[in-house]
């Protein structure tokens, strides 16, 4: 949760901030609600879509040094474990990255496995 | 498969506090959320707060704001909830849940909280 | 906070009856609500998540539907060990919330 000074009424200057929370299906335009006191507020707010990316803010990984290189492929590995998923974020226990293996190339890097729905 | 052992509870004063432990082995401990909820006797279940033990994010029940504490041990595996100032109406089963989107959760066994004098 | 409301508050059935429980959400959670099952003196037990999705190792005949406001669990044959306290919960936004929940008891 947030914390912001909000300088709104007398008795009030510390709001403590939900999630924002998408008014229909998993991002986009929602809600924020915040809480002081006995007092509580609702503000829009946004779930930007590209969190469902395989590397978004979903799912955090720890990973392991690069392996050697696969001459058949020209590519080497990676393997990540999951260090923390947002709360409802169903994210894979363990991912595979891999990447060219020649350096001078520079190339985002490709899940072979993300986070994935049951 | 998680297993989660609860420990810490038992009579305490009005007035008093009380740590809780909820010691985990087996999967990773540190990857996944940490709730505590509690159940008073005959009565429903109740949400207190939840801590990711990776970086100890703690999202609380602002009921619980000025009640419940949650810390981790990660060398530990060891979840805590303290809770101060206790009064009657505190008097719960306490139970510790590890929750994963993707597998579920797994639960401790409970534990009891009685305050009376 | 959201607040959920179960229904019925007690379901009378026989084994091998049809039930079907409720959980009305007082706004749009999408598909974050979960079903537990609890058995006296035994911790909660996740029977369904994300309003439809299976738990390893529960039975079949437990299933969910919704999202939106409106959900149902629903037991297509009811077993003798079917009988317990079924809780409803959202995660969609914080406070995490539960539904009063609802006895499925022995007709």
């Known amino acids: 949760k947030k914390k912001e000074k909000v300088k709104k009424g007398s008795e009030c200057s510390e709001w403590t901030w939900g999630p924002c929370t998408p008014s229909s299906k998993d991002c986009g335009m929602g809600f924020r609600e915040g809480t002081c006191g006995a007092q509580t507020q609702r503000v829009h707010c946004k779930v930007p879509c590209n969190w469902k990316k395989e590397f978004g803010a979903d799912c955090k990984y720890k990973f392991e040094s690069w392996g050697a290189c696969d001459g058949s492929t020209g590519t080497k590995a990676r393997q990540g474990t999951l260090k923390k998923a947002r709360y409802n974020a169903q994210c894979q226990e363990t991912i595979r990255v891999t990447k060219p293996c020649t350096s001078k190339t520079k190339s985002k890097t490709k899940a072979k496995k993300g986070k994935g729905k049951d | 498969q998680v297993q989660l052992v609860q420990s810490g509870g038992g009579l305490v004063q009005p007035g008093g506090s009380l740590r809780l432990s909820c010691a985990a082995s087996?999967?990773?401990?540190?990857?996944?959320?940490m709730n505590w909820v509690r159940q008073a006797p005959g009565q429903g279940l109740e949400w207190i707060g939840m801590i990711h033990p990776s970086d100890s994010e703690t999202i609380l029940n602002q009921k619980f704001k000025d009640k419940a504490t949650l810390t981790v041990d990660i060398s530990k595996n060891t979840a805590y909830l303290q809770m101060n100032s206790l009064r009657a109406e505190d008097t719960a089963v306490y139970y510790c849940?590890?929750?994963?989107?993707?597998?579920?959760?797994?639960w401790g066994q409970g534990t009891l909280v009685t305050v009376s004098s | 906070e959201i607040v959920l409301t179960q229904s019925p508050a007690t379901l009378s059935l026989s084994p091998g009856e049809r039930a079907n429980l409720s959980c009305r959400a007082s706004e749009s959670i999408s598909n974050n609500l979960h079903w537990y099952q609890q058995k006296p003196h035994q911790a909660p037990r996740l029977l369904i998540k994300y309003a439809s999705q299976s738990i390893s190792g529960i039975p079949a005949r437990f299933s969910g539907s919704g999202p939106g406001t409106d959900f149902n669990l629903t037991i297509s044959s009811v077993e003798p060990e079917d009988f317990a306290v079924y809780y409803c919960?959202?995660?969609?936004?914080?406070?995490?919330?539960f539904g009063g929940g609802t006895k499925l008891e022995i007709k």
């Open positions: 919960q959202q995660s969609n936004s914080w406070p995490l919330t």
């Open positions: 087996g999967q990773s401990f540190s990857s996944y959320w």
């Open positions: 849940s590890s929750w994963s989107a993707k597998r579920g959760d797994f």
